[in-house]
Interface confidence: low
């Protein structure tokens, strides 16, 4: 359906509040360095304009595309050249090139300091004084730090954030109420950001087909009672939604997401028995609930996979006539029968099946050639199962911090050229897989672990792509989306690496270390561990354990000393000398 005014259409569909929030998010994701006040002003102007167009669709400029309107508005920012350098050149281009140019300048690692919450009383005063501005600041701060955040989901989290303050600002002990709730929300937001970044990378680097295959597998596991046509319909719509959000088309994305939620609720009988509760909620909660809905029970009468995909005499004919549809049905049938498998594993199995058919359908006797194809999946299934088992055992033995350190050593040896902050960030996140997944029942462990690892390794790939330094990282990141994790797991020590020169400054510590929160203390120690490895890549685990133990004792000693700074400057060089001697 063609609308006279696209902006009026979206304003009417989304309503003023969601429209303004999405515009604020869009601008904050594009111009990450601009102050909050500038973005509020831009969002207000665009919303006022949309409102005018909704009242009179044939008004001046109301017929312009959203990209043209948004781009023109961004290009009015006076500080564009000073703050963003060559991003200002985007404004010389015409649409759609101008929008592509803005997208290309999104910075996945803008380097803003972590958000530190002021005192609870000050926060509550700000919340009560101007709720809308308070929530706008939240949207802005998250969006500029996470330029690919899934915008409609961010509106949902802002609503949750509002709920937390509405409750806790009435509490007797505001801090005790806010602390754990804000932290829990923060964890969810960070995971949501990483998951969407993975989806955007799938679409941008590997195309629609990769994203659709991922979605077919995931949704078939979740909705095993739905038929393939239903899954395909939802996947097609979901792909459109994520393509729009990843492409910066946030109004269209949010609108289409609401339409998809409406469709799923109207057709829940043919999708899943678990949707009812979600479908009674308002739009933001409804979409979120559907995205997180529990798995439906498997239908009881599923026939053997072999019948359709091995024993049928028409396998090659079916495959050759409509390859993607046939492979899609294979993936759907396999996934709905195996909720315990990770999506990545299911996609590897589909890829293996595809390669087998490609080879066998060209032979004189295809059925004999592919007769054992399902048995050939065993090593592909065993590999992630064994990996999860081994790593969960290690996690249980070492705890989260120790497990992170083991991964730090592992990944620094695999890719010592990668920057230290990236190695620390990624290894810390990889280590959280233990906490997140190892306590789950056996039937959920693999799915939880491998799919979480894929999301974290995507962060490594995204950061590495910005400044590529390791050919092996580039290779693992770009060759195959589903084989990224096995590719990284399979990397051995990089024997070509030339050790980094020793720099005493890197191992100089000060008294301010003592007052840092525990997590930041860990980061400092882990940074030292990585630098140590870059200097002495041949260090054994035993040597590293000794040196890190000494380092922990040194920090503890100096933090307990009367003259902390004096202790650090006196004892530090001794520790470094001892470490160097121990690692010869």
């Amino acid at each position: 359906e063609a609308y006279k005014s696209e902006i009026a259409h979206r304003y009417n569909d989304l309503g003023e509040e969601h429209f303004r929030g999405l515009v604020l998010v869009a601008f904050s994701q594009y111009l990450q360095q601009c102050p909050f006040e500038d973005h509020v002003k831009l969002a207000k102007e665009v919303t006022e304009f949309a409102k005018a167009c909704a009242a009179e669709e044939s008004g001046a400029n109301c017929d312009k595309s959203l990209h043209t309107l948004f781009g023109d508005k961004l290009c009015t920012v006076a500080s564009l050249r000073d703050k963003y350098g060559d991003m200002a050149d985007c404004c010389e281009k015409q649409e759609p090139d101008r929008n592509e140019c803005f997208l290309a300048h999104k910075d996945d690692n803008p380097g803003f300091p972590p958000l530190v919450a002021p005192e609870p009383d000050a926060l509550c005063a700000a919340f009560q004084d101007n709720e809308q501005l308070f929530l706008g600041k939240y949207l802005y701060e998250i969006a500029r730090r996470h330029p690919y955040f899934y915008a409609p989901e961010l509106l949902y989290y802002a609503q949750q954030y509002k709920g937390v303050f509405a409750e806790c600002c009435q509490a007797a002990d505001k801090a005790a109420c806010l602390g754990p709730k804000i932290e829990a929300l923060r964890e969810k937001v960070l995971l949501s950001s990483a998951k969407e970044r993975f989806k955007c990378a799938s679409l941008q680097k590997f195309g629609d087909r990769a994203f659709k295959a991922w979605s077919v597998a995931r949704l078939s596991q979740r909705f095993p009672k739905a038929d393939f046509a239903e899954i395909s319909k939802v996947v097609t719509d979901l792909t459109k939604v994520h393509k729009e959000c990843c492409h910066g088309d946030l109004l269209e994305c949010a609108d289409d997401r609401a339409d998809l939620a409406k469709y799923m609720c109207e057709n829940q009988d043919s999708i899943s028995t678990k949707l009812k509760e979600c479908c009674d909620k308002p739009v933001l909660e409804k979409s979120q609930c559907l995205a997180e809905v529990e798995r439906d029970e498997l239908p009881g009468d599923l026939p053997s996979l072999a019948a359709d995909f091995v024993e049928d005499k028409e396998v090659c004919k079916n495959y050759q006539e409509a390859k993607d549809v046939f492979l899609g049905t294979f993936l759907y049938e396999y996934a709905r029968r195996h909720p315990e498998y990770s999506v990545s594993l299911l996609l590897r199995l589909a890829k293996e099946y595809e390669a087998t058919l490609e080879k066998c359908c060209a032979t004189d006797d295809p059925p004999t050639c592919y007769a054992k194809v399902l048995d050939e999946f065993k090593p592909l299934v065993d590999e992630p199962q064994n990996l999860v088992k081994t790593n969960c055992e290690l996690f249980e033995k070492l705890g989260e911090y120790g497990f992170q350190n083991a991964l730090l050593v592992r990944y620094t040896k695999k890719a010592p050229q990668v920057s230290t902050p990236t190695l620390v960030e990624v290894s810390r996140k990889l280590g959280k897989v233990g906490t997140k997944c190892c306590k789950k029942p056996e039937s959920e462990r693999m799915s939880c672990a491998e799919d979480f690892l894929s999301v974290v390794l995507n962060r490594l790939c995204v950061l590495h792509e910005k400044t590529p330094v390791s050919e092996r990282v580039t290779k693992c990141c770009s060759e195959s989306l589903v084989n990224r994790r096995p590719c990284f797991s399979g990397l051995e020590v990089d024997e070509t690496y030339v050790p980094k020169e020793f720099n005493a400054e890197t191992f100089t510590f000060h008294a301010d270390l003592c007052t840092l929160p525990e997590a930041e203390k860990q980061v400092k120690k882990q940074t030292a561990l990585v630098e140590l490895l870059k200097h002495k890549p041949k260090a054994t685990d035993e040597q590293l354990k000794t040196v890190m133990g000494d380092f922990g004792a040194f920090v503890e000693k100096c933090c307990a000393a009367e003259n902390k700074e004096g202790c650090f400057s006196e004892e530090g060089p001794k520790l470094v000398a001892a470490a160097q001697a121990a690692l010869v």
Partner: nanobody
Framework: EVQLLESGGGLVQPGGSLRLSCAAS????????VAWFRQAPGKEREFVAG????????YYADSVKGRFTISRDNSKNTLYLQMNSLRPEDTAVYYC???????????????????WGQGTLVTVSS
């Protein structure tokens, strides 16, 4: 980084044949999805044929199915397009495009290909 260089274009009569070549350097051609696109004067660039990375799955535009064949020689790191039964409407500049990362399929969307050759002109006329 992939460099692509097409050759083999020229003038041919309707019903005739031509074989285009695309020599790749900077990356092995079997590690990348490669495709032929064409652009006729005043028209948009369109997908002609493609071949996946890793597995030789081929795709063709409906207008060339049965007449054109895409293939590659990994030992020569070269992609080919054998064009038979040429028609005047096949007249265009033919481009070779590459999409690294071993995707199993080739996309028909030009934007997804980061690497392009400079093109070779094919004219079908009597």
């Amino acid at each position: 980084e992939v460099q692509l260089l097409e050759s083999g274009g020229g003038l041919v009569q309707p019903g005739g044949s031509l074989r285009l070549s695309c020599a790749a350097s900077g990356r092995y051609i079997d590690e990348t999805a490669v495709a032929w696109f064409r652009q006729a004067p005043g028209k948009e660039r369109e997908f002609v044929a493609g071949i996946g990375g890793g597995v030789d799955i081929t795709y063709y535009a409906d207008s060339v199915k049965g007449r054109f064949t895409i293939s590659r020689d990994n030992s020569k790191n070269t992609l080919y397009l054998q064009m038979n039964s040429l028609r005047p409407e096949d007249t265009a500049v033919y481009y070779c495009a590459a999409r690294p990362g071993k995707p199993l399929i080739t996309s028909k969307v030009a934007d997804l290909y980061p690497y392009w050759g400079q093109g070779t002109l094919v004219t079908v006329s009597s």
